[in-house]
């Protein structure tokens, strides 16, 4: 069994203010069991953007049906983008446990925000 990889295909994504940003992420294996979380930034100060397991994230929707048993696509869409959303977003796989522990991170996708077209 190949070790799980977290694939964030795009190094960068550019979106106009007010639009939605799609950040792609797929994993290459169903093992180990555990949730996906999205963060902006890295390190201890990183900001949680989406947690597959729990929480309320009104601007974030999953692109595919993440509840599907064999789902490997954890891409997200963030609505109504503003300049404050700029940064590098990481898709992170966690291993199920008490508590869940970080298993592997994607390479990151840098989101840049263009001025709203006039």
């Amino acid at each position: 069994e190949e070790e799980l990889q977290v694939i964030q295909p795009d190094k960068s994504v550019s979106v106009a203010a007010g639009e939605s940003a799609i950040l792609h992420c797929t994993v290459t294996s169903l093992i180990p069991v555990g949730p996906i979380q999205w963060f902006r930034g890295a390190g201890p100060a990183r900001e949680l953007i989406y947690n597959q397991k729990e929480g309320h994230f009104p601007r974030v929707t999953t692109v595919s049906e993440s509840t599907k048993r064999e789902n490997m696509d954890f891409s997200i869409s963030i609505s109504n983008i503003t300049p404050a959303d700029a940064g590098t977003y990481y898709c992170v796989k966690f291993r199920k446990g008490s508590p869940d522990t970080e298993f592997k991170s994607g390479a990151g996708t840098e989101l840049s925000v263009r001025a709203k077209p006039s």
Epitope: I7, Q8, P9, D10, K11, S12, T26, A107, T109
Partner: antibody, heavy 119, light 103 residues
Framework: DVQLVESEGGVVRPGESLRLSCEAS????????MTWVRQAPGEGLEWVST????????YYADSVKGRFTISRDNSKNSLYLQMNSLRAEDTAIYYC????????????WGLGTLVTVSS | ALTQPASVSANLGGTVEITCSGG????YGWYQQKSPGSAPVTLI????NRPSNIPSRFSGSTSGSTSTLTITGVQAEDEAVYYC?????????FGAGTTLTVL
């Protein structure tokens, strides 16, 4: 064994239409994104179109957008490419390919079928 | 766009590296085509993964914006065109191809 078998291509005139099909076996077709890639004579590989596992999302290269339509029938393990308003520059070998996990990666390819657009 | 050398050469039994760089991709794949019009064969997908039917002399690695296909113990039958492929849709998926000549 994974097998992807494209239908016979053919010779058509500019402006005409042609439909290609690809029959898949040896894997769970309904779970796989599928792709058409082409290669013009003496040229490199060019991505044409990709369709999602359920068939509800399709992606197209700018060069074929509005003229080509990708579709699939999961009950028949078949992939299709409807090519309309064909141009001389569409002359190529068309390969059916199975996408792996992320759709720009391909793990299996068909043998290809030649489409010639000529007056 | 993905950039790769137009051609490289290697001695029989030697080692050769083919690079692919540029574009907006975090990940890369490698495909081999032995003659024009023949079906491509996947050598590497997602940087390092090798299909089970591919010999272990083919390996892939990615560092930053550059992916490298390494062939160790080059065989005569490795003479072919090698295409890199990117993970970002904006990259046009494929590089222009590198022709490997075995000396």
């Amino acid at each position: 064994d994974v097998q992807l078998v494209e239908s016979e291509g053919g010779v058509v005139r500019p402006g005409e239409s042609l439909r290609l099909s690809c029959e898949a076996s040896g894997f769970t077709f309904r779970n796989s994104y599928m792709t058409w890639v082409r290669q013009a004579p003496g040229e490199g590989l060019e991505w044409v179109s990709t369709i999602s596992d359920t068939g509800d999302t399709a992606y197209y290269a700018d060069s074929v957008k509005g003229r080509f339509t990708i579709s699939r029938d999961n009950s028949k393990n078949s992939l299709y490419l409807q090519m309309n308003s064909l141009r001389a520059e569409d002359t190529a070998i068309y390969y059916c390919a199975k996408s792996w996990i992320w759709w720009t990666f391909f793990d299996y390819w068909g043998l290809g079928t030649l489409v010639t657009v000529s007056s | 766009a993905l950039t790769q050398p137009a051609s490289v050469s290697a001695n029989l039994g030697g080692t050769v590296e083919i690079t692919c760089s540029g574009g907006n991709s975090n990940h890369y794949g490698w495909y081999q085509q032995k003659s024009p019009g023949s079906a491509p064969v996947t050598l590497i997908y997602a940087d390092t993964n090798r299909p089970s039917n591919i010999p272990s002399r083919f390996s892939g690695s990615t560092s930053g914006s550059t992916s490298t296909l390494t062939i160790t113990g080059v065989q005569a039958e490795d003479e072919a065109v090698y295409y890199c492929g990117g993970s970002s849709t904006g990259d046009g998926i494929f590089g222009a191809g590198t022709t490997l000549t075995v000396l």
